[in-house]
């Protein structure tokens, strides 16, 4: 039994780091393998993650962490019974993938303005709480070409757009994702999408 693709890990910078790797053949990850992880720090203890299958030879492990600070560094040991298959390290702050925003809501009752709001996925005491920026994707269910991205570079989790920038009388969907420049993170997954019917009063033409 050998590791074909070494584990790579990303952290949500809150409580979970996810490591993925591939073995050289079909493997029952949960029964055959264990990933041990330990903070490089005084009095820290090794903790065990039981991996799950992720395709035939692929494994994924969700490492539970109480919290993360920028200096944290973990040792990782991948075991198959008594055999050490791979040894490595992982610094969560250098491999951050933020949590996806939630509770995306479209408010359509604000005088021809669409107000989109969502929730910051982090609690106020987490470092990322005040460092997230967002991308909002709006698209038409009827017209695949009607697809747009709005970059929200301010901290408030909301976006206002004129309803007239979208076509009237058709349904749209929106979703939002986050990233943090401070840690040069990857983008989060997209939030679940939300749907609304876009309608607004056309301005009267004056002759």
């Amino acid at each position: 039994m050998k590791v074909l693709q070494e584990p790579t890990c990303v952290s949500d910078y809150m409580s979970i780091s996810t490591c993925e790797w591939k073995m050289n053949g079909p493997t029952n990850c949960s029964t055959e393998l264990r990933l041990l992880y330990q903070l490089v720090f005084l009095l820290s203890e090794a903790h065990t993650c039981i991996p799950e299958n992720n395709g035939g030879a692929g494994c994924v492990c969700h490492l539970l962490m109480d919290d993360v600070v920028s200096a944290d560094n973990y040792t990782l040991d991948l075991w198959a019974g008594q055999q050490l298959l791979w040894k490595g390290s992982f610094k969560p702050s250098e491999h951050v993938k933020p949590r996806a925003p939630g509770n995306l809501t479209v408010h359509t009752n604000v005088s021809d303005t669409l107000l989109l709001t969502w929730s910051n996925p982090y609690p106020p005491d987490n470092y990322l709480y005040n460092h997230l920026t967002y991308a909002v994707n709006i698209w038409s269910e009827n017209d695949p070409a009607d697809f747009r991205i709005y970059n929200v570079t301010y901290l408030e989790p909301s976006l206002r757009i004129a309803a007239s920038t979208l076509k009237s009388g058709i349904s749209y969907r929106a979703r939002v994702r986050a990233w943090a420049q401070c840690y040069n993170t990857t983008w989060s997954e997209w939030s679940p999408s939300t749907k609304w019917h876009n309608s607004y009063r056309e301005p009267f033409e004056q002759h």
Epitope: L42, L43, S44
Partner: antibody, heavy 122, light 107 residues
Framework: EVQLVESGGGLVKPGGSLKLSCAAS????????MHWVRQAPEKGLEWVAY????????YHADTVKGRFTISRDNAKNTLFLQMTSLRSEDTAMYYC???????????????WGQGTSVTVSS | DIQMTQTPSSLSASLGDRVTISCRAS??????LNWYQQKPDGTVKLLIY???RLHSGVPSRFSGGGSGTDYSLTISNLEQEDIATYFC?????????FGGGTKLEIK
């Protein structure tokens, strides 16, 4: 409710021995590391020893190394401090304290006992 | 060993006052700084860990801050029950070491 109750303190002559106990309740004792900390009369706190949940990591302060031994019995939810070759400077209130061995290891001694008094005097 | 220097060693303040206690480490302790309260009967309780994190059940009038070698504990609105001795402790390196304590009294 987390409870730590120390016992075994008392008056002992220099060179003598004493064994302190700390009975734990209200939490899963075998999941936690444990410390002993002492406080000499009218003085500050001094760390004495640490033992992890499975007894595989044990550390003692230089001031007590070779004389004091920390141990634990997880089946009986009890922490011990065996003290030998006692000196007058070991006179202190001895506290046991719980240490969460959580992943991030950022946590301190989060619950302390009420202490047991040790007096070393001829 | 890391030396922890706590100031002042004693402090007299009035109820409702804002009180600050300082703690200096002899080397960088990377925010592994905890604060404990010892009541006159000897009872020791954790207040704040990792510089600024409030232990469960501790009133929000207690707060902590600092970095590197310099740290502080602030009680924003002093109450009668806060009469105690306060100790800082570094958790960065063994042996763990404590400050000398600050005895807080009411004027």
């Amino acid at each position: 409710e987390v409870q730590l109750v120390e016992s075994g303190g008392g008056l002992v002559k220099p060179g003598g021995s004493l064994k302190l106990s700390c009975a734990a309740s209200g939490f899963t004792f075998s999941d936690y590391g444990m410390h002993w900390v002492r406080q000499a009369p009218e003085k500050g706190l001094e760390w004495v020893a640490y033992i992890n949940s499975g007894s595989s990591k044990i550390y003692h302060a230089d001031t007590v190394k070779g004389r004091f031994t920390i141990s634990r019995d997880n089946a009986k939810n009890t922490l011990f401090l065996q003290m030998t070759s006692l000196r007058s400077e070991d006179t202190a209130m001895y506290y046991c304290a719980r240490f969460p061995t959580v992943v991030a290891a950022r946590y301190p001694m989060d619950y302390w006992g009420q202490g047991t008094s040790v007096t070393v005097s001829s | 060993d890391i030396q922890m220097t706590q100031t002042p060693s004693s402090l007299s303040a009035s109820l409702g006052d804002r009180v600050t206690i300082s703690c200096r480490a002899s080397q960088d302790i990377s925010n592994y700084l905890n604060w404990y309260q010892q009541k006159p009967d000897g009872t020791v309780k954790l207040l704040i860990y990792f510089t600024s994190r409030l232990h469960s059940g501790v009133p929000s009038r207690f707060s902590g801050g600092g970095s590197g070698t310099d740290y502080s504990l602030t009680i924003s609105n002093l109450e009668q029950e806060d009469i105690a001795t306060y100790f800082c402790q570094q958790g960065n390196t063994l042996p763990y070491t404590f400050g000398g304590g600050t005895k807080l009294e009411i004027k």
